[in-house]
Every structure is written in C-alpha cells, then in structure tokens.
C-alpha cells in the first residue's frame, strides 16, 4: 500500500570492495525521493542519504565501525516535495535489503605489485598492503590488518620468453622465488581468502615485468 505517486524501491544490492560499501537500488525516481536506514541485527536504525534522488547510498562509514557485524538496510520512498506524506498504512513505503556481513562478503580489490628486487637467482616480490577505510585507534587499517591470516596472495610468474606460468603463495605480502639467471620474468598477483565461500578471489593485478621501472636488480 502507499500513495499512488510513490513506488517502493527494489533490487536492493550491496556493492562492496575492500569495505568501501554502497547500497544500490531501483528505480530511478520520478516525482519521489529516497532515504536509507541501516542497522545491525541488534541495533537501532540510523538514517543516511536523506531525501535523495540518487539510487545509491554510501554506507561505508557505518559498516566500517565493525566489519564482522551483519547489517540490514532499508530504502524509504517519499513523494517529491512532500516528504512528510505517508502511505495509507501510516508510514512511507520501504523495502529491505539482503543481510550483509562485510568481513565475509566484501570483494577483494585488485592488488598492486609494489616492487620487486632481484638478487642473483632470487626475486623478492612485494604486494602493496592496501589501506582500507576501517579504523582502529584513529588509524586506517590495511587489508592485512583487517583479515590477518585469513588473507593470502597468489603470485603468478613466467619467463618473458614463454607462457608457462608458475605459482607461489604467501600469507604475508612478500614472495621470495627462484628464477633462472639472465632471464626476464613477468609477475601478477591475486588476493585470496581461501576459507570464503563467496568472493574468494580478487581480479589479477596489472602485470609487471623485469626490465621495467618497478624493479631493482643486483647481480651477485
């Protein structure tokens, strides 16, 4: 039920990468505006994105307070220019989102290879420890800070002259691999949370190859 000139939001979808979390919905508003509320299972509703004509709302500030909580959002529809107006049931139309647990569900962003250094037949590859918007003691935590040992990185590496890929894994942000002397190698990394059931892997990082700027080389 509700007034004839408002429609309830639908297709409420969480879009979240490295805890940057946006709720999206439909339809594009015609003569109506939206307000979003978010709550934990046991908490009070908090209103966000008041009377907006957007069909998305950035809820990052709320979910980063505790990424292991399970959140629920709802989107209210109001007639444009008359936000006090309610549906015939005495309240605005609204639709609930699916539940969302950031720790379990946020997508892993594309990682970046920070550097690589060759010393003889060893190469040390370092993955950038990306900063998230999760805070503790007034400092922003890195992805590693948040996920700890749940997060691993997989390195794919291959000789520039061939396509046969090798892999290595680490639960830090560094790899130390053996290479053939005199050969140039290319590298790509992927973030993985092996024990997840959904959103287990990131996309692959951009490929970095030896002989380009990122690396350092020291012959022993």
């Amino acid at each position: 039920s509700g007034t004839t000139n408002t429609v309830a939001a639908y297709n409420l979808t969480w879009k979240s990468t490295n805890f940057k979390t946006i709720l999206e919905w439909e339809p594009k508003p015609v003569n109506q505006v939206y307000t979003v509320q978010i709550s934990t299972k046991s908490g009070d509703w908090k209103s966000k994105c008041f009377y907006t004509t957007d069909t998305e709302c950035d809820l990052t500030d709320e979910i980063v307070k505790d990424v292991k909580q399970t959140y629920l959002a709802r989107v209210f529809s109001y007639p444009a220019g008359n936000v006090e107006s309610t549906g015939s049931a005495g309240e605005p139309l609204y639709e609930n989102s699916p539940e969302f647990t950031p720790y379990l569900e946020t997508n892993l962003g594309q990682p970046t290879i920070q550097s690589f250094e060759q010393v003889g037949t060893k190469v040390n590859v370092t993955v950038e420890d990306e900063r998230t918007l999760v805070r503790r003691n007034n400092t922003f935590l890195s992805l590693r800070d948040v996920f700890g040992k749940d997060l691993i990185y997989t390195l794919y590496y291959w000789k520039s002259s061939s396509s046969g890929k090798k892999t290595a894994k680490t639960n830090t942000n560094e790899f130390l691999i053996d290479v053939d002397k005199g050969e140039n190698y290319c590298f790509s990394v992927q973030a993985v949370i092996p024990s997840r059931t959904v959103n287990r892997k990131s996309t692959d990082s951009p490929v970095e190859c030896m002989g380009q700027e990122k690396g350092e080389f020291r012959e022993i």
Partner: antibody
Framework: EVQLVQSGAEVKKPGASVKVSCKAS????????MNWVRQAPGQGLEWMGE????????TYNQKFKARVTLTVDQSTNTAYMELSSLRSEDTAVYYC???????????WGQGTTVTVSS | SIQMTQSPSSLSASVGDRVTITCKAS??????IAWYQQKPGKSPKLLIY???NRYTGVPSRFSGSGYGTDFTFTISSLQPEDIATYYC?????????FGGGTKVEIK
C-alpha cells in the same frame, strides 16, 4: 561432507611424548587453519595452537610452546600434534578443529583421549 | 591474553523456559565471539559466530548478542535436547580463549 578423524586413545608414561593425528576430508585441506584444543577431565576448553596446512607455519599458545609441535602432511591431508615431556596434568581429550573464516571453529574431530600415568 | 568470564557456571531450567548465559571479555573483542554447545562425551559444536550469526543448521531458538566486552547467549525456549555445556570463545586476538562453560540442566 567435511570430516576430521583423529587417531585412537593413548596411554603414556610421564616424560614420554605423544603424537595425535587428524585426517581431514571433504574440503580443501590447505584452505583452512587447523587448530588443536584440549579438555582435561571435567574441565573447560583450552586452545593449544594452530597450523597453516598450506605453508606449515604455526602459532602456539605460550603455555605449550616449549612442548608442542604441530605439523601437516599435505599428501595425506593429515595434521599432527606432538606433545613432549608429558606429565599427569596433560591427561585430557585432545581435539583438532578447523578454523572458519574470521576465527570460529566450525568442525571438530571426535577427540583423542591421552592418559598420562606412571 | 584476553580472559573470558562466563556466568553462571550452571543453571537449571524447565522445558520451554528462556535461558540466558553471559560472557564478559577482559578487553574489547569487537564482535569476535563464538558460542559452542558440548554434550557429554561429544565434541563441541559451533552455534553462533561473530557474536550474533547462527551457524549453518543451528535452530532459530539459539541466538547471540553483544559487542565489545559484554555478550549474551540465549535459548528462547529450552528443549530436552539442549541439555549440554555451553562455551563462549573469543576469536579476536590470539591466543584464542574460552569461557569456563555453563552447564544447562532440566529441572
């Protein structure tokens, strides 16, 4: 179906060592940390340590660090817990448990009773 | 290490009663709390994780709440099969630590 099957009961003399096995099946063994928890008769649960089956890296409860060794055999999907210099207060049921994403122990072995008696 | 204080250590209630167990952490563990059920002679079973999330297949009469240092586990309507010892555990900071347990019996 995820299963953790532990080795049978052991009776040991004080000062000896015991090695308990935990064979995992029904999931990717290297994707989850394996933990060890013990429970003395009539007592609560006490965490001993955990091992990453992918790398073999382990973390121990300081209380047991000098006496416990955790290992894995990836070829047989088996985790091992060895406790040395046994004393009577080590008499307990020892459990292996798979740590789920974020920390909780979702699957447990059936337990192995270790009795230390002279 | 973080100490977990669980209370009461035992309780007796009638079938259908609402049962509440509390767990207090010696420092904030955010939502890093799990609750387990252990029946005599059996391995513990995970019921609740992240303070309030029911694990797969766990009946809806079991629930958890709390944040920071104070947590509550509730059985909304006690059933005969719920006779067991219940443990809280913090999985926020290693070493992982357990509460002392609460033995639940039927009156």
């Amino acid at each position: 179906e995820v299963q953790l099957v532990q080795s049978g009961a052991e009776v040991k003399k004080p000062g000896a060592s015991v090695k308990v096995s935990c064979k995992a099946s029904g999931y990717s063994f290297t994707g989850y940390y394996m933990n060890w928890v013990r429970q003395a008769p009539g007592q609560g649960l006490e965490w001993m340590g955990e091992i990453n089956p992918s790398t073999g890296g382990s973390t121990y409860n300081q209380k047991f660090k000098a006496r416990v060794t955790l290992t894995v055999d990836q070829s047989t999907n088996t985790a091992y817990m060895e406790l040395s210099s046994l004393r009577s207060e080590d008499t307990a049921v020892y459990y292996c448990a798979r740590r789920e994403l974020g920390g909780p122990f979702g699957y447990w072995g059936q337990g192995t009773t270790v009795t230390v008696s002279s | 290490s973080i100490q977990m204080t669980q209370s009461p250590s035992s309780l007796s209630a009638s079938v259908g009663d609402r049962v509440t167990i509390t767990c207090k952490a010696s420092q904030s563990v955010s939502s890093g709390i799990a609750w387990y059920q252990q029946k005599p002679g059996k391995s513990p079973k995970l019921l609740i994780y992240f303070a309030s999330n029911r694990y797969t297949g766990v009946p809806s009469r079991f629930s958890g709440s709390g944040y920071g240092t104070d947590f509550t586990f509730t059985i909304s309507s006690l059933q005969p099969e719920d006779i067991a010892t219940y443990y809280c555990q913090q999985d926020y900071s290693s070493p992982w630590t357990f509460g002392g347990g609460t033995k639940v019996e039927i009156k």
